[in-house]
């Protein structure tokens, strides 16, 4: 099939006092090969500080996955979700505290 670029969605949730969990979800993409990782100050976080979901079919012939990490509240601007798929790439910031969703569809 032809390439379908992912929809990327960054959310945040309270983790513990002073910390938040930020989750980057990529959905509705094809083929299934994708790089999704959190970057801190432009550098990819080490693997042991991130949690990844499996790349799973979403029922429409496309795929979905996610990556999450825990960060200190107030440090959000230093973190970006990096996505690379079929030769295209994009970076996605953590939404501010009053905006819990950040959607981008990449073509």
């Amino acid at each position: 099939g032809s390439t379908v670029p992912p929809m990327v969605n960054v959310t945040r949730s309270e983790a513990s006092e002073g910390n938040i969990t930020v989750t980057c979800r990529a959905s509705s993409f094809y083929p299934r090969n994708i790089i999704l990782t959190w970057r801190q100050d432009g550098v990819s976080l080490s693997h042991d500080t991130q949690q990844w979901g499996d790349v799973l079919p979403d029922g429409n012939g496309t795929y979905q996955t996610w990556v999450a990490t825990r960060i200190c509240r107030g440090e959000e601007q230093r973190f970006t979700c990096y996505m690379e798929h079929s030769g295209n790439h994009s970076t996605h910031p953590v939404p501010s505290g009053n905006s819990h969703h950040h959607h981008h569809h990449h073509h």
Partner: antibody, heavy 121, light 108 residues
Framework: DVQLVESGGGLVQPGGSRKLSCAAS????????IHWVRQAPEKGLEWVAY????????YYADTVKGRFTISRDNPKNTLFLQMTSLRSEDTAMYYC??????????????WGQGTTLTVSS | QIVLTQSPAIMSASLGERVTMTCTAT???????LHWYQQKPGSSPKLWIY???NLASGVPARFSGSGSGTSYSLTIGSMEAEDAATYYC?????????FGTGTKVEIK
Amino acid sequence: DVQLVESGGGLVQPGGSRKLSCAASGFTFSTFGIHWVRQAPEKGLEWVAYISYDSRTIYYADTVKGRFTISRDNPKNTLFLQMTSLRSEDTAMYYCARWAYEGGVNYFDNWGQGTTLTVSS
Amino acid sequence: QIVLTQSPAIMSASLGERVTMTCTATSGVSSSYLHWYQQKPGSSPKLWIYSSSNLASGVPARFSGSGSGTSYSLTIGSMEAEDAATYYCHQFHRSPLTFGTGTKVEIK
């Protein structure tokens, strides 16, 4: 004024160990990632290691992985590079360099004057 | 790891001449994560061009940068004496971070 001052270089025998230090001043050390970069005599720049501001992310060049350890003491504004199993090819000027973040761009904005390490018998 | 090969290794240019050097990566690098540094003998490197094409503060407008994927270049529109230096490309798209092999620009 931002200042990075390296120390600890000198002459070491092959197989020996050495610990380099980088003393920082003039900025809030605990909010910046720092790198070690080296330059062999008459050669180019070689990235050695990186430690994020909170020490949660650490990376090494393949040439030093397993032999060098980067660490930092934020309360003392000091960066370290513990080097073991030293080889002649580790002979170089070692720089510490601050990793800036400005407007979504990250880059080396301040460098120390360097400390020279010579590995020779 | 991503290896960055710069060419030529050394070049001589006359004053006023247009100079172009290249940086070739073994795998694709996002332009956001590709910078150029200038280093003069006895001095630490200085950020020269960031994110492939943006001039750092204080860099003369005769410099420009371009490229994408595995091929990047730095151009000096009209060589001046103060431009004699070694230029390094640098990527942090993938860890380990790497510098290019360097291009030394001399005055002919």
